[in-house]
Every structure is written in C-alpha cells, then in structure tokens.
C-alpha cells in the first residue's frame, strides 16, 4: 500500500494548528471498517492517534490531535495537531493498513518569531571617545536558535568581541542575548540583526552613540528622538540644529537634507545660498535662523508618501549628520452605520451592520461592542483599502442575530493620533424600527 506524505518538513508557528498530511489510494469498494490507521512518533513509537474497527479511537497525545473523519473514505489520513508546542517538533509516522500495509514519516518543524531586539549600553552616560562600552542586544521568545549579526552604521560587519548566548525557557523558546564590546569613536551606530533561520525572519535594532565631547572639529547635529507627527495636508517642521563656532559664516556651510533610505536629495544650502527644493517644491529652510545653527526643514502640504526618515547633513570644516522620522497621520471620519436588511426586522433575524469610516491614516483599529459595553468579536470582518493618496477607507461588517432590542456600537481608532471616531445603531420595537445614535 502506497502512503504519501510531504517531502519537506511542515513548518508550524508555536500556538497555531498544524496539519500533517498523509494520504493513500483506496481501492474500489473500500470501507472504513477495513481501515486501521495509526499515527505515532517515529523515534519513540509513542501512539499519537488511531482509527480502528470503523471508528476514531481519539487522541493519545495530550488531546491535541484530530483526524479528518469526513475525508478518510477518500484516502485522506491527515492529522491535525492543535496549539503546537516546541516539544512537538520531530517526525510523525502515518501507518495505514487495509488488506495491505504501508507507512511514511512526515517531519514537523516548529518555529516562533523573535521579538524586535532591545539595545542597552553599559556604561550609558558620560561617554567619551576612547571609552570601551558594552552594547547588549536582546531578543525574546523565538525558535529555533537565532543567528546574530552585528554591523556599524555603514554596513561594516563587527565580528570581534561579540559574545552571544541563547537560553531556552520552560516552553523551549529561546531568549538571545548578544554582547558587543567596542571602543567609541567620535560617534557611531551599532546595529544588531537577529535572524530566525527557519522563518527567514529578520528582527533588527540599532543604537547611535554620540560621546559627550566630540573631537575638535566634528559637527554635532541634533534632531528630535521621537518621530514628528504631521497631519495630511498640513505643514511639518523637521527640526535639526548644530552649534556654530565663533566666527562662523554661512559661506562655510554645506547643508543637505535627503531621504535616509533612497538618498534622494530633498533640499540643500551650499556656497552661501539656498539651492532650493529638490522635493516637489514643497520644502523650505529657515534662512534667517541658519546662522544661529537652525538647519530645520519645513515640509508643506504633507502627503502620506512623505512618511519616512529624513537625514540632515551639516558640513562646515567637518561633518555631522542625524536622521529624523516623519510619521504622517489623518483622522478618520465619523463612522456611518448601515443595516441589511433594514426593515421588517424581528427577534431571531440575522442582520449585517456595516460601519464605514473614511480617509484616515495609518490603518485603523476597529472595535465593536453592545449597549452594555460587552465586546463583540465573533462574526466581524474588517477591510481597509487605500485610495490614490494612500488614505484608508475602513469598512467593518458585524453579523448578529437580533434580540428583542439592542445597541451595536463601532469604534474606529487612529493608533497614531489616538483619535477615536464612533457610531452606534439601536434596533428596537415590534414591529422593529431602527435609530442611529452618534456619540
């Protein structure tokens, strides 16, 4: 009897369900009464699940397995493994016996993504060029063991003086701690990349260290640490400053703003004059403030496409740079609520309530609740579509079975603006009517 399983391992995330596929070709006239099906762990031969004497004998594996009973007669002997754990990883053998006998083994590869690394510095204050610092990169709850790579701010790999340790917790998930020891230069960016080799998932973080007293001549450029949040259609100021030395003149200044990732020029000031905007004519400097070290950039009529990182390069005799992030946002409109069907409603009827909110950014979070504040999470389908400007229209559909009466409320949240827009509908009466209440 030929039993077929996938050649490649089945990859399953911790906590999700996995299907271990196994199939055979039933002969004409085959009946389930003839079938003996056994799933077992290949190495230990521990019984996992079985089907015999025409019936499912159930799970022998922590009550987390199931067959597909409706599909057995067609030759589908696959096993469903629920709430996958690290300990489930390994080989499972599918034995099928009718008159003849056949078996095949399928591998389960368990995986869990690593968290975004957190970076810590020791010591973390009063740092000076020449100091030795220890940078720790920590990422949590991943599986299998990670690969860790360090590099500087220009992509140069840092492989010396790196110590990486990985510890498994009770669930078998790994916490990875990688320590880099470096001697500080004038300033430096140190980046750590944690890779999950099975998921081919990269999690990375970087830290930029600017020692207190830069060596003579290096330009210290300062920008806000937090992203600048700007509403679509408004103007935004990307702040950037430097400390001019006595006797500084604008003729010495080279100022360049560019997009950090693509290096596209945004705006520049060179040879003692403003070279103007290279970015859709929507940028401006503050010319009267440049001599005092204010290199900030004004971005007009902000669009969704502007979101990202902008780098401010300042060169006088020496050079410095820093990047500032622009986070674009747009408030969501007050939701409109529609009912389908919307008349002759009776208790027991199923209705579809649609909550629609328009032209927001970034994507919204949608929450439903009833008139007593009880969350409604079942039978909710939410879709978000971006228009040409990149703004999202959100449509969330709730299917409910009507009681005697009820209030259904939808809240649309903009996660950046922390702005809530909500609408509700109350369905009452016999014969039923419905009213819209907006709060």
């Amino acid at each position: 009897l030929e039993v077929q399983v996938p050649e490649d391992p089945v990859v399953a995330l911790v906590g999700t369900d996995a299907t271990l596929c196994c199939s055979f070709s039933p002969e004409p006239g085959f009946s389930l009464a003839q079938l003996n099906l056994i799933w077992q762990l290949t190495d230990t031969k521990q019984l996992v699940h079985s089907f015999a004497e025409g019936q499912d004998q159930g799970s022998a594996y922590a009550n987390r397995t199931a067959l597909f009973p409706d599909l057995l007669a067609q030759g589908n002997a696959s096993l469903r493994l629920q709430r996958v754990r690290v300990a489930d990883e390994g080989s499972f053998t599918c034995f099928v016996s009718i008159r003849d006998f056949g078996s095949a083994a399928v591998s389960l590869q368990v995986a869990a993504p690593y968290s975004k690394p957190s970076m810590t510095l020791e010591p973390n204050k009063d740092l000076r060029p020449g100091d030795t610092v220890t940078i720790t990169c920590s990422s949590y709850q991943g599986y299998p063991e990670a690969e860790v790579f360090w590099q500087d701010g220009q992509g140069v790999p840092l492989t010396g003086n790196v110590t990486t340790s990985q510890m498994a917790n009770e669930q078998g998930l790994f916490d990875v701690h990688s320590i880099l020891r470096v001697v500080l230069g004038a300033n430096g960016t140190y980046s750590c990349l944690v890779r999950n080799p099975v998921l081919q998932q990269d999690a990375h973080s970087s830290v930029t260290i600017t020692p207190q007293r830069s060596p003579t001549g290096a330009v210290e450029v300062q920008v806000p640490e937090d992203p600048v949040v700007a509403l679509v259609g408004t103007d935004a100021t990307l702040r950037c400053s430097f400390s001019p030395e006595p006797g500084f003149s604008l003729a010495q200044l080279n100022l360049i703003w560019q997009l950090t990732d693509t290096k596209q020029l945004v705006h520049s000031f060179t040879e003692g004059r403003d070279q103007g905007s290279a970015y859709a004519n929507r940028t401006a400097l503050f010319p009267d403030l440049l001599a005092q070290g204010n290199a900030s950039l004004r971005l007009q009529r902000v669009r969704v496409a502007d979101e990202g990182s902008f780098t401010c390069f300042v060169s006088i005799r020496d050079f410095g740079s820093a990047a500032v992030s622009l986070q674009v946002a747009a408030p969501y409109s007050k939701p409109s609520m529609t009912l389908e069907p919307n008349k002759d409603l009776r208790p027991g009827d199923t209705v579809t309530i649609t909550c629609s909110s328009y032209r927001g950014y970034p994507e919204a979070e949608v929450f439903w609740q009833d008139g007593q504040g009880v969350p409604l999470t079942g039978n909710v389908t939410t879709s978000q579509m971006a228009n040409e400007q990149g703004l999202f229209d959100v449509h969330s559909v709730l299917r409910v079975v009507l009681g005697a009466n009820g209030t259904y409320s939808c809240l649309v949240r903009n996660p950046v603006l922390q702005q809530d827009a909500h609408g509700s509908v109350t369905i009452t009466g016999q014969p039923m009517t419905h009213h819209h209440h907006h709060h």
Epitope: Q151, V156, P157, Q258, T260, K263, F319
Partner: antibody
Framework: EVQLVQSGAEVKKPGSSVKVSCKAS????????IHWVRQAPGQGLEWMGY????????DYAQKFQGRVTLTADKSTSTAYMELSSLRSEDTAVYYC??????????????WGQGTTVTVSS | EIVLTQSPDFQSVTPKEKVTITCRAS?????MNWYQQKPDQSPKLLIK???NLASGVPSRFSGSGSGTDFTLTINSLEAEDAATYYC?????????FGQGTKLEIK
C-alpha cells in the same frame, strides 16, 4: 547623477607603485564607504579593502596587507588606492565602488568604470 | 573567511529557458547580494539583500535563500542576459565574492 570616475590606464614596472584615483560626485562623499575590488584578466572579482572617508578608517584583505594604502580627500571627494611592490600578478582592472544601503542591508550600488593596471618589464 | 561557492561555473542556455544559479556559503551569512557583469563593463547590482530587485532590473530576475544557501533565478532568459554573475557577502570579514557563473546564450 551619482558617479565614480577613475583615473586612466597605467603601465608599471615590477617593484614600482601605482596610485589610482576615484572621484565621487552627485552624493555626500563622507556618508558611504568606498571599496576597491580588482579583477585579473579572465578571473573573478577580488576585494582589496575599504575606506570610510569621514573617519578615514580602513580595512584591508589579508592578501594585500602592507602593500595597499587607501586614502580619501574630503575636499575633492576623491578616494585613492596605492599598491606598492608591484608584480606581474597585479595586472588587473581595479574598480572603486560605493557601499550603499541602510541598516541592516548594504550593497555596491555604484561602480567606477575601472582602471587597467599592467605590470610588465 | 567565508568562502562563497557558485554553481555551475559555466552554463550554455537557450533564450526563454529558466536559469538557476546557486551560491553556497561556508558559514551562515545574514544576506546575499548578486551582481551582473558583461564583457568589458563594470559589475552592476542585480539583487540586494537576498531577494530585493535593484532599481531598473527586469522582473524576470529573482533571488532567494537563507543561512548558507542562496539562489539567483532568471525566468525566461533573454539574449541580453549573457554575462557573468557574482554573489557577495559581508556578514563577516573579509568581504567575499563567489567565483562567478558565466552564462552563454546558445
């Protein structure tokens, strides 16, 4: 337009030195490392080393340690590669290249046109 | 030193064919870049960070892989794809290239 323009071909005697220049334009010279890669006739690409024009940090492939010197002049946005004690095996095309990208992914996005160095007695 | 071994060294293929070039690293690397070099020209960036197409590169080129095994695929080869292809890593010093794979069009 971002460009790296290299100096012209050179013919050198064994035991002598050669200095190849690479002039950058169209971008902030100090923001990226410049690497040197050579290619002997009919052979593959071989990395020689890099310079960070801002900090002037350098690193060289073991094979060229002691024989190659990389420098950079910020005022003219030019990088230089000097190879000494030349031998016939150093006959090759020498390329400079900009190492670009952003954390954590980097790559050579701009290459010079190459400088042919011929070592012959 | 991480050694990158490409296979094959040489391949003669007909237009419209699918071509796969592999690059195996002697130790795990964080990502791989791929370059195309035509005769008497400088190398040109093709694929960055394992799987991202460089600007202006036709969509018939693609990259994949992880750890020690990486692949460059050309779907439906065209005559202009005759060139030598190199993989490159700099996850650890020194920076290394593969020995190159020369593609000839029949």
């Amino acid at each position: 337009e971002v460009q790296l323009v290299q100096s012209g071909a050179e013919v050198k005697k064994p035991g002598s030195s050669v200095k190849v220049s690479c002039k950058a334009s169209g971008y902030s010279f100090t923001s990226y490392t410049i690497h040197w890669v050579r290619q002997a006739p009919g052979q593959g690409l071989e990395w020689m080393g890099y310079i960070n024009p801002n900090s002037r940090n350098t690193d060289y492939a073991q094979k060229f340690q002691g024989r190659v010197t990389l420098t950079a002049d910020k005022s003219t946005s030019t990088a230089y590669m000097e190879l000494s004690s030349l031998r016939s095996e150093d006959t090759a095309v020498y390329y400079c290249a900009r190492y670009s990208g952003s954390t954590p992914y980097w790559y050579f996005d701009v290459w010079g046109q190459g400088t042919t160095v011929t070592v012959s007695s | 030193e991480i050694v990158l071994t490409q296979s094959p060294d040489f391949q003669s293929v007909t237009p419209k064919e699918k071509v796969t070039i592999t690059c195996r690293a002697s130790s795990s690397v964080s990502y791989m870049n791929w370059y195309q070099q035509k005769p008497d020209q400088s190398p040109k960036l093709l694929i960055k960070a394992t799987s991202n197409l460089a600007s202006g590169v036709p969509s018939r080129f693609s990259g994949s892989g992880s750890g020690t095994d990486f692949t460059l695929t050309i779907n439906s080869l065209e005559a202009e794809d005759a060139a030598t292809y190199y993989c490159q890593q700099w996850s650890s010093n020194p920076l290394t290239f593969g020995q190159g794979t020369k593609l000839e069009i029949k």
